[in-house]
């Protein structure tokens, strides 16, 4: 029951985050004129991923796409790689933690495969909501470097007579959704691998084992062992032979990596 | 079509109030108050958001001018207190349009403050 | 606040003749943002309100003849009237668009030579 709830919670959270990453990569505020102290201003200039906005006093507001892609900054494109990396990943994983979802009953899929696909998910996600959180902090970083070098240059002109203000330009919505958004995402990544722990199966049946011995060939089914449901040190679970076994479809027989998460 | 009616000029004496309407039928975002003294240039007074009732104002006129806006009657106001004589002037309330250009205006209302 | 200066304050001219008003701007009226300098001209005839000629220094507001034109950027405009017409003699002003408070220029005056 608390793997089930752990498991639609991190579902949950992931699909708010990722929503979240979609919003934020769409919005135009991704950097806003700064206003000073004047919070009335005639024209305001904010600019996003794909577009530059101006919004003057009279309502207007017009919009004018970046119709470039090797004329924009280096870093532009970067965050927006990541952003798009971020979606795409997360996208993905909620395709996946669909069928993963233990409420969500998908033919005969074994519990197994359930934990599989969680796991494979809720990294999923952990990396998505990690491409957004830097993507969102790449850009920050960016137009704190621009505002200060713009703040030491505030003003230029020739002899002081004629002054040419220069835009200022400071945090946008589409900033602070991003970063939550993100964190949402990770820690949906992180409830979805918890649960991915408490979904492998209690008992794991392990295909016949052929040992080759000299002279003679015996066939050899150990009963199988728990899993370890511990981080420690896994003294139970002691290799069956240190010779040549092997399964006969190369699943090696020490814990799954459904342990180690 | 957007039609502009200014009203509620007159005499007043210095030191007196005023408040002027400015009749709005059409779509505004956003409205001002532009003033003539008597054979001088134009002069800008205030600016109002009429959604969000948020003002703006030249540095002669705050805290003596208040502008206003009227949601239900579509009226914008000035409200004019301690007048001046250097105050007389038309009065115009003009709507506000694409590169913040006035493209409507009233016709004006005359204030003359005197004694 | 950004002071607007015109020039000339008056001038004289035939009907057919080619006029420039010239409006200088204490700081740039051009937006980074778009590129467009916020600059606006305006006729004023006597005893009438003033009418909407130019907006953005350069795009005509519907209506007004192509005879008009606009140019400039940054801290220089221009308002050309390419073949004076009879109904042109007016008050001509320029008005910064660009920042609270919005300021206007002194006005030229063009009267019939």
């Known amino acids: 029951m608390a793997v089930t709830a752990c498991q639609g919670l991190g579902f949950v959270v992931s699909l708010i985050g990722i929503a979240g990453i979609i919003a934020a990569t769409c919005m135009d505020q991704w950097s806003t004129q700064d206003l000073y102290n004047n919070p009335v201003t005639a024209v305001f200039n904010y600019q996003g991923l794909w577009r530059s906005c101006v919004r003057e006093s009279s309502g207007f507001t017009e919009c004018r796409g970046y119709f470039t892609l090797l004329g924009l900054p280096a870093m532009l494109q970067a965050v927006r790689a990541l952003m798009i990396v971020g979606i795409v990943l997360g996208a993905i994983g909620l395709l996946v933690s669909i069928f993963a979802l233990k409420c969500i009953r998908i033919g005969s899929m074994e519990d197994s495969a359930k934990a599989n696909m969680t796991l494979t998910s809720g990294i999923m996600f952990i990396v998505s909501g990690l491409c957004a959180i830097a993507g969102v902090s790449v850009f920050a970083n960016m137009l704190v470097t621009n505002f200060w070098m713009s703040t030491a240059n505030m003003y230029t002109g020739m002899g002081g007579m004629v002054q040419t203000v220069q835009t200022r330009y400071t945090f946008g919505a589409a900033l602070f959704v991003g970063w939550v958004a993100g964190g949402l995402t990770l820690i949906g990544g992180v409830m979805m691998c918890i649960a991915c722990r408490g979904l492998a199966p209690e008992e794991t049946n392990y295909k016949a084992v052929s040992y080759h011995a000299s002279g003679h060939s015996v066939a050899y089914k150990p009963g199988g062992f728990k899993a370890s449901t511990g981080f420690g040190s896994n003294t139970k679970n002691k290799k069956i032979y240190d010779g040549g076994a092997r399964t006969e479809d190369e699943v090696q027989s020490y814990p799954s990596k459904h342990d180690y998460v | 079509e957007v039609q502009l009616v200014e009203s509620g000029g007159g005499l007043v004496q210095p030191g007196g109030s005023l408040r002027l309407s400015c009749a709005v039928s059409g779509y505004t975002f956003s409205m001002n108050w532009v003033r003539q003294a008597p054979g001088k240039g134009l002069e800008w007074v205030a600016w109002?958001?009429?959604?969000?009732?948020?003002?703006t104002y030249a540095d002669d006129f705050k805290g003596r001018f208040t502008i206003s806006r009227d949601d239900s009657k579509n009226t914008l106001y000035l409200q004019m207190n301690s007048l001046r004589a250097e105050d007389t002037a038309v009065y115009y309330c003009?709507?506000?349009?694409?590169?913040?250009?006035?493209?409507?205006w009233g016709q004006g209302t005359l204030v003359t403050v005197s004694s | 606040d950004i002071q607007m200066t015109q020039s000339p304050s008056s001038l004289s001219a035939s009907v057919g003749d080619r006029v420039t008003i010239t409006c200088k701007s204490s700081?740039?009226?051009?937006?980074?943002?778009?590129?467009?300098?916020?600059l606006t001209w305006y006729q004023q005839k006597p005893g009438k309100a003033p009418k909407l000629l130019i907006y953005w220094a350069s795009t005509l507001e519907s209506g007004v003849p192509s005879r008009f034109s606009g140019s400039g950027s940054g801290t220089d405009y221009t308002l050309t009237i390419s073949s004076l017409q009879p109904e042109d003699f007016a008050t001509y002003y320029c008005q910064n668009a660009y920042s609270f408070p919005f300021t206007f220029g002194q006005g030229t005056k063009v009267e019939i030579k």
């Open positions: 109002i958001n009429m959604y969000t009732g948020e003002p």
């Open positions: 003009a709507r506000s349009s694409r590169g913040n250009g006035f493209d409507y």
């Open positions: 700081q740039s009226l051009l937006n980074s943002g778009n590129q467009k300098s916020y």
